[in-house]
Interface confidence: medium
């Protein structure tokens, strides 16, 4: 019986060009985490395997960094990074737990709108 729950950072926003940490936490279960997958829609971003360590998908290796912990750091954000991200916890013996994070990447307020906030 699956008793655990996934806590996530929920809906988050960040500025274009910046970085963001995606974080999930599995609680209320004694199941052993064997692997965590990080996915965006149907794309695999990274995995953290308990025995084999981290693997970042080749197409994301320049902009994705492992950690902190089982989390994932996205760098050099673009507006195309806006969307749903999923942390998929493979556990034994419970099975699979999935958490959802929605990331909105905003145009930089300084770069795009800085002039209108200047003090005369």
């Amino acid at each position: 019986m699956m008793t655990g729950t996934i806590e996530t950072t929920g809906n988050i926003s960040a500025e274009k060009g910046g970085s963001i940490i995606l974080q999930c936490h599995l609680s209320s279960t004694t199941a052993q985490v064997t692997q965590v997958n990080w996915e965006q829609q149907d794309q695999l971003l990274a995995i953290c395997n308990a025995d084999l360590g981290w693997h970042i998908s080749p197409s994301f290796k320049d902009r994705v960094a492992p950690g902190p912990g089982l989390g994932l750091t996205l760098q050099s954000l673009t507006v195309n990074d806006t969307g749903e991200y999923f942390c998929i916890y493979h556990t034994y013996p419970d099975g699979t737990y999935t958490g959802r994070i929605f990331l909105e990447v905003l145009e930089s307020s300084v770069a795009e709108h800085g002039a209108r906030f200047q003090i005369p």
Epitope: T34, L44, N49, A50, L52, H90
Partner: nanobody
């Protein structure tokens, strides 16, 4: 739906080599690892090796084959390979390819597709 077809099995003398192939039909999107397992007559199926499908940088081997077997994946051909060197009579078994969600200490967790198997016989 993904289907797996193994090939490359056969009869080989002790100390010889074989290369097994596992061709996947269909698009592998959710699989993280491709794994090889084997089942000897009268024994349970056991883990042999696994490789991450995207990138190939993570590999795992059973202690009994470390240093003798090498697993790899060619995404462009949708095929995983098992290069078996220094074969021993105790390597005789039907070898199965499997699509895995997880590799590591819990090899049998998260497996959702099996091939039909290919027989490897090591005998003089």
């Amino acid at each position: 739906e993904v289907q797996l077809v193994e090939s490359g099995g056969g009869l080989v003398q002790p100390g010889g080599s074989l290369r097994l192939s596992c061709a996947a039909s269909g698009t592998i999107t959710s699989a993280v690892f491709m794994g090889w397992f084997r089942q000897a007559p009268g024994k349970e199926r056991e883990f042999v090796a696994a490789v991450i499908w995207r990138g190939g940088s993570l590999k795992s081997y059973a202690d009994s084959v470390k240093g003798r077997f090498t697993i790899s994946a060619d995404n462009s051909k949708n095929t995983a390979y098992l290069q078996m060197n220094s074969l021993k009579p105790e390597d005789t078994a039907v070898y199965y390819c499997a699509k895995l969600a997880v590799a590591g200490n819990y090899y049998y967790y998260g497996m959702d597709v099996w091939g039909q198997g290919t027989l490897v016989t090591v005998s003089s």
